[in-house]
């Protein structure tokens, strides 16, 4: 056998090159047949009507033919015949790859609530061979479950992903990525997750700056509430007691002027949205004001000079806790 061919793999719509090669040429004629055994070329003669076949090279040692705009119907065995005595025959198989026609991602719900499990589907339509679908949430790969449907040598793959969402997933893309021999580079489609979650509440002391609250001082607390949807109601209450009469509420801010010991207690900021409600507590402890000790006095009879030394001593029974955080989130 001195007639050789090579199998050809080509992407639909592109060009396939079929080559019939003769090792030891003796001027025998070469013929190329299609899968129906119809003559494509006999030497340089092409009886077949299909003008997509064009002669690239013809000699006693090679018949090289191009087939443009390849379609899936062109797939199959192509026969090279060498009319030696006895005649020789070899075949080349053309395999046509079809990239997925369409890539669609479908999320069961446009908006999900934290903790909920949602279904995401991705469909790669009409490819050959079947497409491999990979899932990513941001940069993290997830495992989906794929189903393959075959129709007329083409494959439609649907992959299902069950995803439990968390508040951190809000705005994160869910990516459906396909891997297919006819696709170079990344073919992917994505949808951004929209996750609703109950508020997260944080209390910040905006005054005094050093964080130490003393009798006579003022206190300003700011309540920060973040949620989706953004909380519309932010309220301040005093746990187990009435709010002091001299307390001023202004939106998320709580002002208490001229602090005294009766203001000691727990102040709660509450926030809510359609998902749920949350609160954060601030435990106020009002410290004693600074105390002063009278200085010693010296008196002389002739020349009298009075020196008064004022020594300010700060006494604080909780001095060791000056910088401690006194807010509790719930």
């Amino acid at each position: 056998q001195n007639l050789f061919t090579k199998d050809v793999t080509v992407i639909e719509g592109e060009v396939a090159t079929i080559s019939c090669q003769v090792n030891k040429s003796d001027d025998s004629v070469i013929q190329l047949l299609n899968p129906n055994r119809q003559t494509i070329y006999f030497r340089d003669f092409r009886p077949l009507k299909d003008s997509r076949f064009q002669l690239l090279n013809f000699s006693s040692s090679e018949l090289k033919v191009s087939l443009t705009n390849v379609s899936i119907s062109d797939e199959g065995r192509y026969f090279c015949q060498l009319y030696t005595d006895p005649p020789q025959e070899s075949y080349t198989t053309i395999t046509v790859l079809v990239p997925p026609r369409n890539l669609m991602i479908d999320i069961q719900k446009d908006t999900a609530v934290e903790g909920e499990e949602i279904e995401v589907n991705c469909t790669a339509m009409a490819s050959k061979p079947a497409t491999t679908i990979r899932w990513f949430k941001g940069n993290t790969e997830l495992k989906g479950k794929s189903e393959v449907e075959e129709w007329s040598d083409m494959y439609t793959v649907t992959s299902q992903l069950m995803l439990k969402v968390h508040k951190e997933d809000d705005g994160v893309p869910v990516i459906c990525q396909v891997e297919h021999p006819a696709v170079t580079g990344n073919l992917q489609t994505q949808r951004y997750l929209e996750v609703q979650y109950k508020p997260q509440v944080h209390i910040q002391m905006t005054y005094p700056l050093q964080g130490l609250t003393r009798e006579g001082d003022a206190l300003e607390l700011t309540c920060e509430a973040i949620g989706k949807p953004q909380p519309v109601m932010v309220t301040w209450v005093r746990v187990d007691d009435e709010m002091p009469q001299h307390a001023v509420l202004s939106g998320p801010n709580l002002f208490i002027n001229n602090l005294n010991k009766t203001d000691n207690g727990t102040y709660r900021c509450e926030a809510s949205n359609i998902v749920g409600k949350a609160h954060s507590d601030y435990m106020l402890y009002v410290y004693d004001p600074p105390t002063t000790i009278p200085p010693p006095t010296t008196t002389t009879t002739t020349t009298t000079t009075t020196t008064t030394t004022i020594l300010t001593i700060i006494t604080d029974s909780r001095a060791g806790e000056e910088g401690s955080i006194r807010a509790v989130d719930h």
Epitope: V29, T39, D44, F45, L48
Partner: antibody
């Protein structure tokens, strides 16, 4: 040496039939497509029909379709043209030629005259 | 009637170059190879050029062929008296699924 010898021509009345033969030698007959080409007096050649090595593919010029049949017998190294319902315009020298599209060898021809 | 068009005649003195054109369409010359035949008076046609520009063994290199698009041409350089003959182009027509010949050109050596 490649040789193609046609026979079977002659005078025939319109509507009549003739069978032309071509005896091939000097090459492997079963390896080649074969053709019939005709040439009316004072005119250029006109391709008539061709046939694949195993006889599985045949092509004809429109003017003879349904009236002429090309065939071959590889065991006898012979090519045939059965001509029925002959017309005056079929009058020509009929050549047997080797090849389907490229006719690299021709016979000397046989004259077919269709006349009443 | 012929599908391929050639000039009816061409002439030249010995040693001159003569060119014959053959015009067709996308379904014949445009998509298939062209052959040229020489027919001396009283004889069968003989293959002169095949596959657009290839010469069979025994054909002098004075004969050359070319093809461009839907036209082909035959050139005879160094014209000789024995070149006086009828010349025909021929190819396959993919639309007709039939062979086609040119109208023929008579070459005269003056």
């Amino acid at each position: 040496e490649v040789q193609l010898v046609e026979s079977g021509g002659g005078l025939v009345q319109p509507g009549g039939s003739l069978r032309l033969s071509c005896a091939a030698s000097g090459f492997t007959f079963s390896s080649y497509w074969m053709s019939w080409v005709r040439q009316a007096p004072g005119k250029g050649p006109e391709w008539v029909a061709n046939i694949k090595q195993d006889g599985s593919e045949k092509y004809y010029v429109d003017s003879v379709k349904g009236r002429f049949t090309i065939s071959r017998d590889n065991a006898k190294n012979s090519l045939y043209l059965q001509m029925n319902s002959l017309r005056a315009e079929d009058t020509a020298v009929y050549y047997c030629a080797r090849g389907g599209g490229r006719h690299d060898y021709w016979g000397q021809g046989t004259l077919v005259t269709v006349s009443s | 009637q012929s599908v391929l068009t050639q000039p009816p005649s061409a002439s030249g003195t010995p040693g001159q170059r003569v060119t014959i054109s053959c015009s067709g369409s996308s379904s014949n010359i445009g998509s298939n190879t062209v052959n040229w035949y020489q027919q001396l008076p009283g004889t069968a046609p003989k293959l002169l050029i095949y596959s657009n520009n290839q010469r069979p063994s025994g054909v002098p290199d004075r004969f050359s062929g070319s093809k461009s698009g839907t036209s082909a041409s035959l050139a005879i350089s160094g014209l000789q008296s024995e070149d006086e003959a009828d010349y025909y182009c021929g190819t396959w027509d993919s639309s007709l699924s039939a062979g086609v010949f040119g109208t023929g050109t008579k070459v005269t050596v003056l």
